[in-house]
């Protein structure tokens, strides 16, 4: 699955919240980033993400099997310089300090459940999902023929703004 | 390469229902989202809804919420979309499309069907 | 609902010249738009999406270009298969809106 350009095709900045309208909220902790799934109280501002979004060619296309095969793969930065990205080893997901490139492990494919409704899939690891597990974001397996349909990987998008990138 | 067929013209009564088709082929079907998009004579495009064939999942224009019921059948790769109370004002030319992206509809309608024009006429 | 609106409504170019034509969102889009040619009798065909990424197998004379509400499609040096209708779309966001289409007929 390789990234077919090094800039983003587009990207918006929104909040994330669960199938359950929880909040993915980031804190700052020892000089480190902390991620944390929880009810918002009333006047507490959502946490905001920048959404990069990038064009990739299916594993299929590229062995000739398939027609077109493009895929959009997404990046998710909180806050400057930081990125969500999968543990493969630990099935955990973490925000790291990156330089760009950024490794495969900060791109996920993304899967539309409906408009606001998405599924993020691990680019490092297929069939792999950001989920929902004890408050915490994790890394969880889905089986293809469950139609990825586990609420537990549904994530709710609300866009706050179009992000001009340059 | 992908295409995507729809069923022929009709002429059908007014308050009557109509189901069209469109079977889809060169590509893995329940992979991409299939669109429905509206074209009145001589007019620009409506965006009526969309359906994941994987699931199911669909997504509707509120203006055609109550018009246009869609559905697939995976075993054949066909999308289907029925009107249903048919008026003079549902005459035109519909389109199945489908988006460049695996998975991720993004409402881009890359792949367009040859479209089936429905007449609603006494 | 965002409203797109395209202008002018039609023009009349000859074979060669460059022609710009004008996409105007009511609130902004980002480059969240695709442009679309419709000849004559056949469906619309992709030619642009997030607002400047040419689709597979488009000309390069096809150019689009803008950002936020104002948006632009250029044809460097039209063909006369360029005679068509051209429209704007808002993407990514729901409902999709279309403009009302610009005409281009060719001298």
């Known amino acids: 699955m390789s990234i077919t350009g090094i800039s983003p095709i587009t990207e918006s900045l929104a909040s994330l919240s669960t199938y359950n309208d929880q909040s993915i909220t980031f804190a700052l902790e020892d000089e480190s980033y902390e991620i944390y799934v929880e009810d918002l109280k009333k006047d507490k501002k959502k946490d905001k993400v920048l959404l990069s979004y990038y064009e990739s060619q299916h594993p299929s296309s590229e062995s000739g099997d398939g027609v077109d095969g493009k895929m959009l793969m997404v990046t998710l930065s909180p806050t400057k310089d930081f990125w969500l990205q999968a543990n493969n080893k630990e099935h955990s997901v973490e925000l790291h300090k990156s330089e760009k490139p950024l490794p495969d492990q900060a791109f996920f494919v993304l899967h539309n459940r409906s408009f606001n409704s998405v599924s993020f899939e691990s680019k490092t690891d297929p069939g792999v999902f950001i989920g929902v597990k004890d408050n915490h974001l994790a890394l969880i397996k889905v089986d293809y023929s469950e139609n990825l349909g586990s609420e537990n990987i549904l994530f709710k998008l609300s866009e706050i703004h179009h992000h001009h990138h340059h | 390469q992908v295409n995507l067929l729809q069923s022929g013209a009709t002429l059908v009564k007014p308050g009557a229902s109509m189901k069209m088709s469109c079977k889809a082929s060169?590509?893995?079907?329940?992979?991409?989202?299939v669109s429905w998009v509206k074209q009145s004579h001589g007019k620009s495009l409506e965006w009526i809804g969309e359906i994941y064939p994987n699931s199911g999942a669909n997504n509707f224009n509120k203006e055609f919420k109550d018009k246009a019921t869609l559905t697939v059948d995976k075993s054949t790769s066909t999308a289907y979309m029925e009107l249903t109370r048919l008026t003079s004002e549902d005459s035109a030319v519909y389109y199945c499309?489908?988006?460049?992206?695996?998975?991720?509809?993004?409402?881009?309608?890359?792949?367009w069907g040859q479209g089936t024009l429905v007449t609603v006429s006494s | 609902i965002i409203v797109m609106t395209q202008s002018p409504k039609s023009m009349s170019i000859s074979v060669g010249d460059r022609v710009t034509m004008n996409c105007k969102a009511s609130?902004?889009?980002?480059?969240?738009i695709a442009w679309y040619r419709q000849k004559p009798g056949q469906s619309p065909e992709l030619l642009i999406y997030y607002a400047s990424n040419r689709y597979t197998g488009v000309p390069d004379r096809f150019t689009g270009g803008g950002y936020g509400t104002d948006f632009t499609l250029t044809i460097n040096s039209v063909q006369a298969e360029d005679a068509a209708f051209y429209y704007c779309q808002r993407i990514y966001n729901s409902p999709p809106t279309f403009g009302g289409g610009t005409k281009v007929e060719i001298k």
């Open positions: 060169g590509y893995s079907f329940t992979d991409y989202w």
């Open positions: 499309t489908r988006g460049p992206y695996y998975y991720s509809s993004q409402i881009i309608f890359a792949y």
């Open positions: 609130q902004n889009v980002g480059n969240n």
